[in-house]
């Protein structure tokens, strides 16, 4: 039985040109996390494998950085980065847990202040 829950950063608006950290946290389960995939609109951005470490998709290498932790840092944001991001936790023996974060990238005049900085 899958008892775990995923907590996320929550939906975020951020400034064009800035950077943002997307984070998920799996709780309420003793299952072992074997891999975390980060995806956007059916595109794989990055993988963090418990044994092999991080792999960033080649097409995102310039603008995606691993971490902190199992999170993902998106840099040099453009309005085209607006969309839904998925953290997909592969666990044993539970199976797969998915968290969802919607990011809206805005011109600086309407973005929330502080969105370019790291999560406290």
């Amino acid at each position: 039985m899958m008892t775990g829950t995923i907590e996320t950063t929550g939906n975020i608006s951020a400034e064009k040109g800035g950077s943002i950290i997307l984070q998920c946290h799996l709780s309420s389960t003793t299952a072992q996390v074997t891999q975390v995939n980060w995806e956007q609109q059916d595109q794989l951005l990055a993988i963090c494998n418990a044994d092999l470490g991080w792999h960033i998709s080649p097409s995102f290498k310039d603008r995606v950085a691993p971490g902190p932790g199992l999170g993902l840092t998106l840099q040099s944001l453009t309005v085209n980065d607006t969309g839904e991001y998925f953290c997909i936790y592969h666990t044993y023996p539970d199976g797969t847990y998915t968290g969802r974060i919607f990011l809206e990238v805005l011109e600086s005049s309407v973005a929330e202040h502080g969105a370019r900085f790291q999560i406290p």
Epitope: G10, N11, T82, E104
Partner: antibody, heavy 119, light 112 residues
Framework: EVQLQQSGPELVKPGASMKISCKAS????????MNWVKQSHGKNLEWIGL????????SYNQKFEGKATLTVDKSSSTAYMELLSLTSEDSAVYYC????????????WGQGTSVTVSS | DVVVTQTPLSLPVSFGDQVSISCRSS???????????LSWFLHKPGQSPQLIMY???NRFSGVPDRFSGSGSGTDFTLKISTIKPEDLGMYYC?????????FGGGTKLEIK
């Protein structure tokens, strides 16, 4: 003046599919997210999902994945929602609603499209 | 999904009354940057829903200042200081912090 003009009421048979349109005017269509909302039984509101006109992205309430398909036509400033394999549970009023930048809410709403599923 | 609960379900009022509508969420609506995405709508019969308040306490353009929004975390309130006839209808809160966005069940503001 921002306006969202939706297509007219529909009476459709169970198992059929249909498409609702939402034509935007009075603002730059590609600058704003478009949301879709279902109102059943004259009361409950449910967020179906959204489309992102400037990059073609979508986000769905998982409850409506496989039921609703959201698309946009930038050339005509029109958003569409196709409803698939209709059943009586899909009888409702459907609204399109423009997103407010940076606040994850809706500011302007269409007039609603009534969909009745009946044989 | 985040469950949003509104109370009361029905609120009988007299014109001139001050009223409060409560909205509670099953988890905090504060995102990692301290932003809270909670909005309020009024839905009058035969009309489309209309935005009243967004970001907890920002009044939408054209909304009179007798409307005010407050709250934090999981507990939010919409106050109307002096009820007028045009204020009657169904009030809904909406959380947009977590996917999917979810509405409260509604509060019907009606005349006594």
């Amino acid at each position: 003046e921002v306006q969202l003009q939706q297509s007219g009421p529909e009476l459709v048979k169970p198992g059929a599919s249909m498409k609702i349109s939402c034509k935007a005017s009075g603002y730059s269509f590609t600058d704003y997210i478009m949301n879709w909302v279902k109102q059943s039984h004259g009361k409950n509101l449910e967020w179906i999902g959204l489309s992102i006109p400037y990059n073609g992205g979508t986000s769905y309430n998982q409850k409506f994945e496989g039921k609703a398909t959201l698309t946009v036509d930038k050339s005509s400033s029109t958003a569409y929602m196709e409803l698939l394999s209709l059943t009586s549970e899909d009888s409702a009023v459907y609204y399109c609603a423009r997103g407010i930048k940076g606040y994850f809410a809706m500011d302007y709403w269409g007039q609603g499209t009534s969909v009745t599923v009946s044989s | 999904d985040v469950v949003v609960t509104q109370t009361p379900l029905s609120l009988p009022v007299s014109f001139g009354d001050q009223v409060s509508i409560s909205c509670r969420s099953s988890q905090s609506l504060v995102n990692s940057f301290g932003k809270t995405y909670l909005s309020w709508f009024l839905h009058k019969p035969g009309q489309s829903p209309q935005l009243i308040m967004y970001g907890v306490s920002n009044r939408f353009s054209g909304v009179p200042d007798r409307f005010s929004g407050s709250g934090s975390g999981t507990d939010f309130t919409l106050k109307i200081s002096t009820i007028k006839p045009e204020d009657l209808g169904m009030y809904y809160c909406l959380q947009g912090t977590h996917q999917p966005w979810t509405f409260g069940g509604g509060t019907k503001l009606e005349i006594k």
